[in-house]
């Protein structure tokens, strides 16, 4: 009874319906189901298509541009659970640009275990306001349901029985409105007593066994579940897999030989991207977690003594890292057998991404070449690099080669980083922001001092655009208010005071005191500091009455810690020596102030003597909020209410709806009744800055999602004929 069919791998079905038949015997899709990009399909093509065996999808369901599909009620009549183990951009259910879809119709969908729902740009889609998503998933506030026909109030959603004046479907309250709940004109939404939690219930409302998820055919019986809350084993739902079984893919129990088969299939297939499954913590998982290595005799992950080695052999002896994607291919590697060439010109959140992917590398057997990486400010993302062997060298016998890196300012923080270069020389040319002192420090630390020849380190083209500071600036005065910080620092003058062009004050929000000047920075603006240019003070001839330069930082956030440092801006001197000074990074917190107003107040009267008031915390607490003040005042009754003849014909029922606080901007737009505008009495208020900002954020969020969708969905055609799913491994 439980999962009567097969367990199928994740599927990507596109272009036409032929591969849809692979779903025929599937009860569980272990992975995701994507049905998309079918432009020639018509409604009649879907008439006889049904997959009643499909009960559960472990990852997500995505439908995108499938023409002719009007409802999912026949396609997936028994889909009960979407687990969301892996999500599509935080969503477990995505319905996007489905031009002919009129209703969802997933009338047996009872639980989305993780993730939320995105239903967007479906201009025929109705029966959305009749679904109580809070009965299906926890994070309803993260749902994104906009730009559907339902938004325009053009849907005449009629639940079963309504046409005959009956209410057949359960009604639940959302935003104070009592609404009948249904998926289609012939299918109610099944609503269980809330005491049943997510376990589901029988038609009489008897709660399913606590190991069930979503539904069952009988209460109190873990063998009569439709799907399992925890794990499935031999026709029964169990809390945890007992020995000799292992947890697999977060939903079922498998034995050792199952896991071993997966391991060997991958090992023997030589297919890229497959996983040699291992056993750890009673789970059969794709790879050992960091800090563990596999014992090949029993597939068990055992703790490494010291850091775990993961040797990565580079094809053709070298690899060029020119994007985050190419860096990801080396994720987890600790030893690089070959040479690395870093050539990164741009990207998003680069420093963090590079550290996540290259930060475990401890050893490179060949050379390391940093070439035209305009986006790099520091090499600190090679957090653990301790050894460059130089067994193969770049032409000219170089084991470390840095050429034309326009924004490279720091190699490593040499006070915290040790690097040994066993053989080979250093090469530094055209690194205008990299001070020679930094290069000389590397020579000392790495043990390469004396190996370089005259032109290996160019004196003229390294550090020629940098302020290579060698003195420490100290702050002499700091004062704070809730939105300002006043700073002064000790005066600094280079030998020729005319060389001082001014100071640069750097600051950024820093919740933790662990900021360094270059960490997390790249030349593309990621995690960048805010920089203020400050003119030098007037120079006094009396050294005792020197003006202390300073700056009043304005427009800061209250109750926020800022990291701040200041450095000099000096001209390039003729003697090939640039003077300068820089402060340490200091941390200063602004004062607290009044919080902004609490957000989204809703009031509902739940009886003749009570009003329930709910609100969200203010967007800007501006300090630690300890309590809220609630004021109320009795209002005089409107005399009209007493004078009105309630028997007048044509009197409309009063509507007491308010714009629910969690609705999207779009639906609020449509809620403004159109005749209000045309009456000419009211005109819409101009949008506030925060509204405009919110709309910009909203549209930016929409674009980000669309970009993500297109990047994932549109893949180049494989020249060889593909087999089955794009990713046939258990995903």
């Amino acid at each position: 009874h439980l999962y009567p069919g097969e367990v199928c791998p994740g599927m990507d079905i596109r272009n036409n319906l032929t591969r849809l038949h692979e779903l025929e015997n599937c009860s569980v899709i272990e992975g995701h189901l994507q049905i998309l990009l079918m432009f020639k399909t018509r409604p009649e093509d879907f008439r006889d298509l049904s997959f009643p065996k499909l009960i559960m999808i472990t990852d997500y369901l995505l439908l995108f541009r499938v023409y002719g599909l009007e409802s999912l009620k026949d396609l997936f009549p028994n889909l009960t659970v979407i687990r969301g183990s892996r999500l599509f951009f935080n969503y477990a259910l995505v319905i996007f640009e489905m031009v002919h879809l009129k209703e969802l119709g997933l009338y047996n969908l009872m639980n989305i275990t993780r993730g939320s729902v995105r239903i967007e740009k479906n201009n025929e889609l109705c029966y959305l306001a009749t679904i109580d998503w809070s009965r299906i998933l926890d994070s309803v506030e993260d749902n994104y349901i906009v730009l559907n026909k339902d938004d325009n109030e053009e849907c005449g959603d009629i639940c079963p029985g309504t046409a005959k004046g009956k209410t057949n479907c359960p009604a639940t309250v959302i935003n104070g409105q009592f609404v009948e709940r249904c998926w289609t004109h012939s299918h109610c939404q099944k609503v269980c007593p809330t005491i049943c939690k997510s376990h589901g219930c029988t038609a009489e409302g008897l709660c399913c066994h606590s190991e069930c998820l979503g539904n069952c055919s009988q209460p109190d019986d873990p063998t009569k579940c439709v799907a399992c809350r925890n794990f499935y084993l031999d026709g029964r739902c169990v809390e945890t897999c007992p020995p000799p079984y292992y947890h697999f893919q977060d939903w079922r129990c498998v034995n050792f030989s199952f896991c071993q088969d997966l391991h060997h299939k991958c090992k023997n297939s030589r297919r890229q991207g497959c996983h040699q499954y291992v056993i750890h913590n009673n789970k059969c998982i794709p790879e050992c977690p960091s800090g563990y290595t596999m014992n090949s005799s029993n597939l068990l992950c055992t703790p490494c003594l010291g850091p775990c080695p993961k040797v990565c052999h580079l094809l053709e002896g070298e690899k060029t890292i020119d994007s985050v994607t190419s860096a990801q291919e080396l994720r987890g590697c600790t030893v690089i057998n070959g040479s690395l060439i870093i050539n990164i010109r741009g990207g998003n959140n680069l420093a963090a991404e590079l550290e996540a992917n290259l930060g475990l590398i401890e050893e490179i057997s060949g050379y390391l070449k940093i070439r035209r990486s305009y986006a790099l400010v520091s090499l600190s993302f090679f957090r653990k690099l301790r050894l460059i062997r130089g067994e193969t060298l770049e032409i000219g016998n170089y084991s470390f080669y840095a050429l034309d890196n326009q924004n490279l300012r720091q190699l490593w923080d040499w006070s915290k980083h040790n690097l040994t270069i066993t053989q080979g020389k250093l090469f530094f040319h055209y690194n205008p922001k990299l001070c020679l002192s930094e290069i000389h420090k590397m020579e000392e630390v790495s043990g390469t001092k004396g190996r370089q020849e005259r032109n290996d380190i160019a004196l003229k083209t390294n550090g020629d655009q940098a302020s290579c500071e060698n003195e420490l600036l100290k702050f002499s005065y700091i004062r704070t208010s809730f939105d300002k910080i006043l700073l002064r620092w000790e005066p600094y003058w280079p030998p020729d005071f005319r060389d001082l062009l001014g100071f640069m004050l750097f600051y950024k929000e820093a919740p933790y005191q662990n900021v360094t000047e270059f960490d997390g920075q790249d030349a593309c603006g990621s995690n960048s500091w805010t920089v203020v240019d400050i003119d030098p003070p007037l120079r006094s001839n009396d050294p005792k009455s020197q003006n202390h330069p300073g700056w009043l930082m304005r427009g800061l956030k209250p109750w926020t810690q800022y990291a701040i440092f200041v450095k000099t801006l000096v001209t390039f001197s003729d003697e090939r020596r640039t003077y300068g000074a820089k402060s340490d990074i200091i941390y200063v917190q602004t004062d607290a102030t009044n919080p902004s107003v609490p957000l989204d107040p809703i009031s509902v009267s739940n009886s003749s003597s009570q009003i329930i008031l709910k609100w969200k915390p203010p967007s800007d607490p501006n300090g630690n909020i300890t309590h809220y003040l609630v004021f109320w005042e009795r209002q005089a009754e409107d005399s009209e209410l007493f004078e009105l003849d309630y028997c007048l014909k044509g009197l409309k029922l009063p509507s007491r709806t308010w714009s629910p606080p969690f609705e999207s901007e779009d639906s609020q737009k449509h809620n403004q009744s159109e005749y209000e505008d045309s009456a000419g009495e009211c005109c819409s208020c101009p949008k506030t800055d925060s509204q405009i900002l919110k709309e910009l954020e909203e549209s930016s969020f929409r674009k980000t999602f669309e970009d993500y969708l297109h990047n994932v969905v549109f893949v180049p055609r494989k020249t060889s004929s593909g087999t089955g799913a794009e990713d046939p491994r258990p995903s």
């Epitope: 009489e204 409302g205 399913c208």
Partner: antibody, heavy 118, light 107 residues
Framework: QMQLVQSGAEMKKPGASVKVSCKAS????????ITWVRQAPGQGPEWMGW????????NYAQKFQDRVTMTTDTSTSTAYMELRSLKSDDTAVYFC???????????WGQGTLVTVSS | AIRMTQSPSTLSASVGDRVTITCRAS??????LAWYQQKPGKAPKLLIY???TLESGVPSRFSGSRSGTEFTLTISSLQPDDFATYYC?????????FGGGTKVEIK
């Protein structure tokens, strides 16, 4: 024949504790939950809480949360309800009932009278 | 907690009468309501659940219905065995709550 047999009447002083037992027979104990309901003289029943026969998970009414503990012994198919810090208004008949689907109390024990008096 | 208000608290009737007992919930409980019958010195006995479904073995003269948050237990023709106290119980949400009871006595 399915039945629930409860322990005998108890007389307690204020501040004391009482532990009532409920022995089940005629069905598989671990397949169903046990709920405890009390009824003060001349009053309606009052739900106290529920315990799963499968894994011992409990759900107590907030009113009793700090004073009640429900347990099971699957080897003897017995459920127990202990109520601490007794007050005079805890005087009532305490019933155990088999809970089908958590809330359907289809079989009841005969009740145990607990009298709290100084 | 959801309050269940039963009315009347006492009802005098004769054998053969049609009897109606009402139970009102302080908030929506959908159809998740049960009716119990209790005789003096005995435990309650389940009669009806999910508003209108008869527990097996319960005579068909008992029926239940609902209008919004108001629920009704009807005995179409009162029998001597039916003189007892009747309680409604909601099981939509915790804590499960009972009504105060309606005592049906002989007129």
């Amino acid at each position: 024949q399915m039945q629930l047999v409860q322990s005998g009447a108890e007389m307690k002083k204020p501040g004391a504790s009482v532990k009532v037992s409920c022995k089940a027979s005629g069905y598989s104990f671990s397949d169903y939950g046990i709920t405890w309901v009390r009824q003060a003289p001349g009053q309606g029943p009052e739900w106290m809480g529920w315990i799963s026969g499968y894994n011992g998970n409990t759900n107590y009414a907030q009113k009793f949360q700090d004073r009640v503990t429900m347990t099971t012994d699957t080897s003897t198919s017995t459920a127990y309800m202990e109520l601490r810090s007794l007050k005079s208004d805890d005087t009532a008949v305490y019933f155990c009932a088999r809970a089908r689907g958590v809330w359907m109390f289809d079989n009841w024990g005969q009740g145990t009278l607990v009298t709290v008096s100084s | 907690a959801i309050r269940m208000t039963q009315s009347p608290s006492t009802l005098s009737a004769s054998v053969g009468d049609r009897v109606t007992i009402t139970c009102r919930a302080s908030q929506s409980i959908s159809t998740w309501l049960a009716w119990y019958q209790q005789k003096p010195g005995k435990a309650p006995k389940l009669l009806i659940y999910t508003t209108s479904t008869l527990e097996s073995g319960v005579p068909s003269r008992f029926s239940g219905s609902r209008s919004g948050t108001e629920f009704t237990l009807t005995i179409s023709s009162l029998q001597p065995d039916d003189f007892a106290t009747y309680y409604c119980q909601q099981y939509n949400s915790y804590p499960l709550t009972f009504g105060g009871g309606t005592k049906v006595e002989i007129k």
